[in-house]
Every structure is written in C-alpha cells, then in structure tokens.
C-alpha cells in the first residue's frame, strides 16, 4: 500500500507540474473582484461600470473563456481527490499575498472550494486551504 | 467616518528612537493589511513597511529593515512604527495606510512629521 | 526592487485642457492572475496622498471620471481629459507587484 501511496504521490506530482492553475487563478480574482464591484462596497465606485476600464474584467469573454479552460485542468485531477485538494492548494498559494483583507481572503477560499462543483465535479471531502493570513511576498 | 490618526513625531537626534502610532476608527482596522508610507522634505513618497491583518506577515524597505518595525494591537485598533537608529535621511512626514484588501493604499491619516537632527 | 520612471516630472497646465503623465517600471507589472499591479496617487498641496487609480484602469470611489488610467506591463498612463484647478498637486504611480515601490512624483501645477 506504501508503494501504491508514493506512487500516487509521484503522479500526482507530475499531474501538478503539467497542469496550467493560472485560468483558474484568474477566474477566481476576477469573480470575488466582480463581486466587490457589483455592490459598489470599497474601494469600487457604485457609480462606475466596473466591467469596462479594464480588459480582465469584462463580463462575457474573459471570465466565462477562464472558466472554461480551469475546468478543463481541473478534469485531470477528478479521479484523484488528493490530487484535487493539492491543486486547490497551489491556487490559494499562489494567490494568497493579494489579498490583504481577510473577507478577500475569506470571499476568494469560498469560491476556491465551490470551484470543483462549478465545473461539474466532484469536491475534495477535507481540503485545508489556509494559508498564512495576509499572504506572503515570496520573491 | 474613517480615521487615522498619526502621532508620536517630533525631533530627535541621530542614533535615538522613536515610536509613531496611528489610530484608526470608522474603518474595520483589524481586516486588513495596514501600511507606513513617509515623504521627505522635497522629496516624493516612498513606502516604508506594511504588516498583514492578522499580523503574521510584516513587510519592509531595504532603507529601513533591520531598523524599523512594524506591529499592530487589535484590542486597541492602533498601528506603531517603532524606528530606531535614526537617520537624518529618516527626516520626513510619517502616513499610515489602510490596505484595499487587493493591494492599493486606499485610506490615508494626515500624517506625522519626525524631524532627525542633532 | 522594482524601479517606477514617472514623466514629465513637472507639467504645467492649462485650465480646460487635456493632461497626460507617463509611468515606465523596470519590469513587468503583470501578475499571473492577469492583473497589473499598477496604482496611481494624488498628493494635493497641504493633504494626504488619495488613490485615483488602483489596477492600471479601474477608478477608485468618488474619483471624477476625467480621470483614466491605461497600459500593462512595463507602459502605464494616467490622463486627465479636461484639468481643472482642483487638479493641481502631484502625482504618483506605485507598484503592488513586489511588496510596493512609488515613482519619483510629477508635479501638475496651472500655466
């Protein structure tokens, strides 16, 4: 079973070095940003289209398109739910030094963990996706 | 209304220390990162150090690490500066910050002048 | 470290007239996210800094909309479509990339 397990571990290693997590870190930023936007709550003028200053932020094609292409990386993990919960992590990871308010950091886990069903699979059980709090600058 | 209140400046000479607070009210001091940012006479701002909400995480210039340090008390919704070893180059107008939650300096005190002469 | 070239450093201006401020960083400011970790800042004579512009272009609360932030990357731009004399102060583009660095300022002041 030991040897089944590093097995495991080994491919699910390599499943995460191949797998491009950007799609889905962009989707996410730009969903809780578009959420902050929509009820004009600060920094985001209420007044403003907030869709469209910026070509990220558009409401159609960049989100739906990021969407897309997440669930078509997030796929390979859906028969490896450790693998799964390791993907998610490396997406909080990577994520985690922009968000500097804790309802960001709380707003962007929640989607994060609801990510999975979105794309029509099936969740990780126990994923712990708490990171330092604040983020960390890793340069 | 969201408030912050710098103190704590004043003259001080060379190789002393200095302790800056800020208080904040009206805001939800302790969601978010909070940031020290100084502008020297004649000069432009220049951001100095920051700590993350929950106070794990602190962040610092090159000019200022090992010198200055940042840290916060949620009971008291307050941020310190303590600055040691003073510079004359440390001469400047002292603000705090508050942090957006995604990295943009939104809420700003009016600022606290340090004076480094002998 | 992150190095921001803001010009012109100092741009008179006319009253009515169009303005624009340049803000060149020595590396990209694109994160993986998407988004660019670009800001702009106002310091008016005798206040505290105020944020314009956060993310390159979106405008911050209760910003008038003759303000306008654009670029990515390297490139950012701030423009203001028409001064007016409250405009008056400098102004600063920060990154957030890398921990946060300002640019050396630009002083807008009336011709």
């Known amino acids: 079973r030991q040897q089944w397990e590093l097995q495991g571990d080994r491919r699910c290693q390599s499943q995460l070095e191949r797998a491009n997590l950007r799609p889905c870190e962009q989707h996410l930023m730009q969903k809780i940003q578009r959420d902050e936007d929509s009820y004009g709550r600060d920094p985001y003028s209420p007044s403003q289209d907030p869709y469209s200053p910026s070509p990220y932020d558009r409401r159609g094609a960049g989100s739906s398109q990021h969407q897309e292409r997440c669930c078509n990386e997030l796929n390979e993990f859906e028969n490896n739910q450790r693998c799964m919960c390791e993907a998610l992590q490396q997406i909080m990871e990577n994520q985690s030094d922009r968000l500097q308010g804790r309802q960001q950091e709380q707003q962007f886990k929640r989607e994060l963990r609801n990510l999975p069903q979105q794309c029509g699979l099936r969740a990780p059980q126990r994923c712990d996706l708490e990171v330092e709090s604040g983020g960390r600058d890793r340069y | 209304q969201v408030q912050l209140v710098e103190s704590g400046g004043g003259v001080v000479q060379p190789g002393r220390s200095l302790r800056l607070s800020c208080a904040a009210s009206?805001?939800?001091?302790?969601?978010?990162?909070m940031h020290w940012v100084r502008r020297a006479p004649g000069k432009g701002l220049e951001w100095v150090a920051a700590i993350s909400y929950g106070g794990t995480n602190k962040y610092y210039a090159d000019s200022v690490k090992g010198r200055f340090t940042i840290s916060r008390d949620s009971s008291k919704n307050t941020l310190y500066l303590q600055m040691n070893s003073l510079r004359a180059e440390d001469t400047a107008v002292y603000y705090c910050?508050?942090?957006?939650?995604?990295?943009?300096?939104?809420?700003w005190g009016q600022g606290t002048l340090v004076t480094v002469s002998s | 470290e992150i190095v921001l070239t803001q010009s012109p450093l100092s741009l008179p201006v006319t009253p009515g007239e169009p303005a624009s401020i340049s803000c060149r960083s020595s590396q990209s400011l694109v994160h993986r996210n998407g988004y660019n970790y670009l800001d702009w800042y106002l310091q008016k004579p005798g206040q505290s800094p105020q944020l314009l512009i956060y993310?390159?272009?979106k405008r911050a609360s209760g910003v008038p909309d003759r303000f306008s932030g654009s670029g990515s990357g390297t490139d950012f731009t701030l423009k203001i479509s028409r001064v007016e004399a409250e405009d008056v102060g400098v102004y600063y583009c920060m990154q957030a990339l890398q921990t946060w660095t300002f640019g050396q300022g630009t002083k807008v002041e009336i011709k």
């Open positions: 910050a508050r942090d957006s939650g995604y990295r943009s300096l939104l809420h």
């Open positions: 009206g805001i939800a001091f302790n969601d978010y990162t």
């Open positions: 993310m390159a272009s």
